[in-house]
């Protein structure tokens, strides 16, 4: 069965994630996706109403880090 | 602890303009992935999603009723705003707002029950 | 956007029987599918979240299983404190949606 995410995290780690281990927050579908199943990201085009690239969101990410920008689909952290 | 509490007006008149607030605590909505947004139901009918917001201020909406619907976050103040225009008695509903953070709905609030009639 | 067709919209059942419920999706969601509780006059309460992970402080008696277009919640045994109408909702992609509803009354 899967382990539902976690968010409590130590003073110095990372911000939480809300994948669980193996899966990364997919920005064009909004949920956490198995890792594998992401696509190389596209540039997002200006003015973009809905993120078009198919990305990952890093747990390290920085928030406010654009949705076209890419991402390595690194699996959340516990 | 997460909580969620919608508030606005009880009874609207058809045309008017709708504004509901949902004001949350227990988690901030500028943690990465993290989301809130808003369904409603009608009474004794089925939930239907409106819209919802994102940690990076991306939006999305319900295709049929974008038009007349408007979502925004003040981070600083744990709140998002839904805004709906054009008010019509068939919106009369229950409305609620709710936290996705990864894996869809997952905290509701209690909901708020909103009147259109002249 | 994806239609989920939930059955049946209503069931009645004693106390200790075994409730199932399913959820057709019309199109492959790939277990992103939650099920929720909601009581009279109250708001839903997440139970299952990705088919079949269990919520935080949501009793064993409740399951879920599936996959592909075709998903299942379980109550193992029925207790009078579980009248309520259950709901799924799919999140594989927006606009996320919800199933009609099944009314679960006590014989």
């Known amino acids: 069965m899967r382990r539902g995410p976690r968010s409590l995290r130590g003073r110095d780690a990372p911000a939480p994630t809300p994948c669980v281990p193996a899966e990364c927050f997919d920005l064009l579908v909004r949920h956490c996706v198995a890792c594998g199943l992401l696509r190389t990201p596209r540039p997002k085009p200006a003015g973009a109403s809905s993120p078009a690239p198919r990305t990952a969101l890093q747990p390290q990410e920085s928030v406010g880090a654009g949705a076209g920008e890419a991402a390595l689909p690194l699996p959340g952290l516990l | 602890q997460v909580t969620l509490k919608e508030s606005g007006p009880t009874l609207v008149k058809p045309t008017q303009t709708l504004t509901l607030t949902c004001t949350f605590s227990g988690f901030s909505l500028s943690t990465s992935g993290m989301g809130v947004g808003w369904i409603r139901q009608p009474p004794g009918k089925a939930l239907e999603w409106l819209a919802h917001?994102?940690?990076?201020?991306?939006?999305y909406y319900n295709p049929s009723l974008k038009s007349r619907l408007t979502i925004t976050k003040d981070t600083s103040k744990n709140q998002v705003v839904l805004t709906m225009t054009n008010m019509d008695p068939v919106d009369t509903a229950t409305y609620y707002c709710?936290?996705?953070f990864g894996y869809g709905l997952d905290y509701w609030g209690q909901g708020t029950l909103v009147t259109v009639s002249s | 956007d994806i239609q989920m067709t939930q059955s049946p919209s209503s069931l009645s059942a004693s106390v200790g029987d075994r409730v199932t419920i399913t959820c057709q999706a019309s199109q492959d969601i790939s277990n992103y599918l939650n099920w929720y509780q909601q009581k009279p006059g109250k708001a839903p309460k997440l139970l299952i979240y990705y088919t079949s992970s269990l919520h935080t402080g949501v009793p064993s008696r409740f399951s879920g299983s599936g996959s592909g277009t075709d998903y299942t919640f379980t109550i193992s045994s029925l207790q009078p404190e579980d009248i309520a109408t259950y709901y799924c909702h799919q999140f594989s992609e927006l606009p996320w949606t919800f199933g009609g509803g099944t009314k679960v009354e006590i014989k």
């Open positions: 917001i994102w940690w990076d201020d991306d939006k």
């Open positions: 709710a936290r996705s």
